[in-house]
Interface confidence: low
């Protein structure tokens, strides 16, 4: 694959528009320096996108995975 | 619908300038690399050019080094090509398309939503 | 830059026909290849990304396979609306550079 020359976040910009139902998993990155980080693969073509934090589904996704972290 | 659509169309002498334009609507424009690629008459496709989501890399193809400069406008949802010392080779069908990167850097999957096509024709 | 030949030119197939079209690239390029189809006075539309995915809603007839620097599109079963021009590219260094394409053509 070609090769970065210089270090970057992974993701630098964030694609809106992603329904809900089209994402197969979410990975969050936890990478120094970078603003928050969450890839998806998609379910229609097995692509990655990187999604836009502030989407509202994202926000209460997190929301759920963190109250669930705490009540553990 | 996503779509594409090019403008700019022209007769140029050698040596003119044009500039072509791409309005992007349907998708996140700003999220996504731009490219532009042209093919001559009876000929093949020429990959041009591209640029990435905020315009701090940019690509060019040899042929065209120094005489056309890609941009964009993302408010606009909008990519340009400014064509400066055009030659009778230039002569061609400019596409503009969407380059599909994934969330790496090394990630491409190739340009999967293209424009109509503009045609430049450089004759005197 | 990295150069890429097709082959064959043009082909002469019948509806139901497998057609087998090569790419082959003049150093490695691992699997960064995409293939595109091309109908006269149209816009080329993306089959194939990263030589064997197949873009979405693109029949499955198409496939596509090859790694370094061979690349195969196969279209298992012709169909009418598959007659038209191919095209590889790829996407490993600048420039991206494409195939020279091939015609298939009705026999």
């Known amino acids: 694959k070609p090769v970065s020359l210089s270090y970057r976040c992974p993701c630098r910009f964030f694609e809106s528009h992603v329904a809900r139902a089209n994402v197969k998993h979410l990975k969050i990155l936890n990478t120094p320096n970078c603003a928050l980080q969450i890839v998806a693969r998609l379910k229609n073509n097995n692509r990655q996108v990187c999604i836009d934090p502030k989407l509202k589904w994202i926000q209460e996704y997190l929301e759920k995975a963190l109250n669930k972290r705490f009540k553990m | 619908e996503v779509q594409l659509v090019e403008s700019g169309r022209g007769l140029v002498q050698p040596g003119g300038s044009l500039r072509l334009s791409c309005a992007a609507s349907?998708?996140?424009?700003?999220?996504?690399?731009m490219s532009w690629v042209r093919q001559a008459p009876g000929k093949g496709l020429e990959w041009v050019a591209n640029?990435?989501?905020?315009?701090?890399?940019?690509y060019y193809v040899d042929s065209v080094k120094g005489r056309f400069t890609i941009s964009r406008d993302n408010a606009k949802n909008s990519l340009y090509l400014q064509m400066n010392s055009l030659r009778a080779e230039d002569t061609a069908v400019y596409y503009c398309?969407?380059?599909?990167?994934?969330?790496?850097?090394?990630?491409?999957?190739?340009?999967?939503?293209w424009g109509q096509g503009t045609t430049v024709t450089v004759s005197s | 830059a990295i150069r890429m030949t097709q082959s064959p030119s043009s082909v002469s197939a019948s509806v139901g026909d497998r057609v087998t079209i090569t790419c082959r690239a003049s150093q490695g390029i691992s699997s960064a290849l995409a293939w595109y189809q091309q109908t006269p006075g149209k816009a080329p539309k993306l089959l194939i990304y990263d030589a064997s995915s197949l873009e979405s809603g693109v029949p499955s007839r198409f496939s596509g396979s090859g790694s370094g620097t061979d690349f195969t599109l196969t279209i298992s079963s012709l169909q009418p609306e598959d007659f038209a021009t191919y095209y590889c590219q790829q996407f490993n260094s600048y420039p991206r550079t494409f195939g020279q394409g091939t015609k298939v053509e009705i026999k």
């Open positions: 398309a969407r380059d599909l990167t994934g969330p790496y850097y090394y990630d491409y999957y190739g340009m999967d939503v």
């Open positions: 640029m990435n989501q905020d315009g701090s890399e940019k």
């Open positions: 349907g998708f996140t424009f700003s999220s996504y690399w």
